[in-house]
Amino acid sequence: VPLSRTVRCTCISISNQPVNPRSLEKLEIIPASQFCPRVEIIATMKKKGEKRCLNPESKAIKNLLKAVSKERSKRSP
């Protein structure tokens, strides 16, 4: 699990690879703060509730975020 117990950043390792938007339970975008100097993206998978840290600088992850927001805007009235 790519999560650390320190009070600073949550993610130790990050992935450049996208996942299927439909397999996501939750996608958290944590802005940079005094505790962690970088934006962090934490994906919770539907299967087993596994958490994955995604690289916000990766083009593939940016495409994933775009797909997720498109899905959400379709669902909202």
Partner: antibody
Framework: EVQLVQSGAEVKKPGATVKISCKVS????????MHWVRQAPGKGLKWMGW????????TYADDFKGRFTFTLDTSTSTAYMELSSLRSEDTAVYYC????????????WGQGTTVTVSS | DIQMTQSPSSLSASVGDRVTITCKAS??????IAWYQQKPGKAPKLLIH???TLQPGIPSRFSGSGSGRDYTFTISSLQPEDIATYYC?????????FGQGTKLEIK
């Protein structure tokens, strides 16, 4: 040198199943997603989908849902594409292609595997 | 899905000619376009990504330009070894799409 080496040509009968392999070398297999592309005889390139090589999760393009299965064997750094219930229109060259996910494009391709479906 | 309309579908030119191929996306793809060369019986080869960034080892006679929905691939001086089919690819989306291809022949 980064290489994607695919299995050899296959001739199959309609209704059969084919499994193509794509063995990688020269980089860490689980660092990049693997995509599959189809090219029918005399036609253009068609993207089929990808597999996340870290978690083994496949995603299929709409036209390739149902009979197509992408899998991995991380112990041998090999990606597989299986196609069941073969039809004559599945006759094509199938390519695996590494995605340089950070920038988003396909940078290295396998040499292609020709699948011929004929009775 | 984003559609990529590539033109022309075929092109005949002489050695030394300037050759131009265009791809038009159905929506803004924010410069996320790559160009590939495919010779008969071979896999596609990446020439250019992010509209105009040449891959290492690719001759400088190949170039790309464009923005928004409209993109151009140019060979400044056609060489005999450039005979191939060329494809554009948009990757501004999780669903990748190729252009239909342009077959380039020598006059």
């Amino acid at each position: 040198e980064v290489q994607l080496v695919q299995s050899g040509a296959e001739v199959k009968k309609p209704g059969a199943t084919v499994k193509i392999s794509c063995k990688v070398s020269g980089y860490t297999f689980t660092d990049y997603s693997m995509h599959w592309v189809r090219q029918a005889p005399g036609k253009g390139l068609k993207w089929m989908g990808w597999i996340n090589t870290e978690i083994g999760e496949p995603t299929y393009a709409d036209d390739f849902k149902g009979r197509f299965t992408f899998t991995l064997d991380t112990s041998t750094s090999t990606a597989y594409m299986e196609l069941s219930s073969l039809r004559s229109e599945d006759t094509a060259v199938y390519y695996c292609a590494r995605n340089y996910d950070y920038d988003g494009y396909f940078d290295v391709w396998g040499q292609g595997t020709t699948v011929t479906v004929s009775s | 899905d984003i559609q990529m309309t590539q033109s022309p579908s075929s092109l005949s030119a002489s050695v030394g000619d300037r050759v131009t191929i265009t791809c038009k996306a159905s929506q803004d793809i924010n410069k996320y376009i790559a160009w590939y060369q495919q010779k008969p019986g071979k896999a596609p080869k990446l020439l250019i990504h992010y509209t105009s960034t040449l891959q290492p080892g690719i001759p400088s006679r190949f170039s790309g330009s464009g923005s928004g929905r409209d993109y151009t691939f140019t060979i400044s001086s056609l060489q005999p070894e450039d005979i191939a089919t060329y494809y554009c690819l948009q990757y501004d989306n999780l669903l990748f799409t190729f252009g239909q291809g342009t077959k380039l022949e020598i006059k």
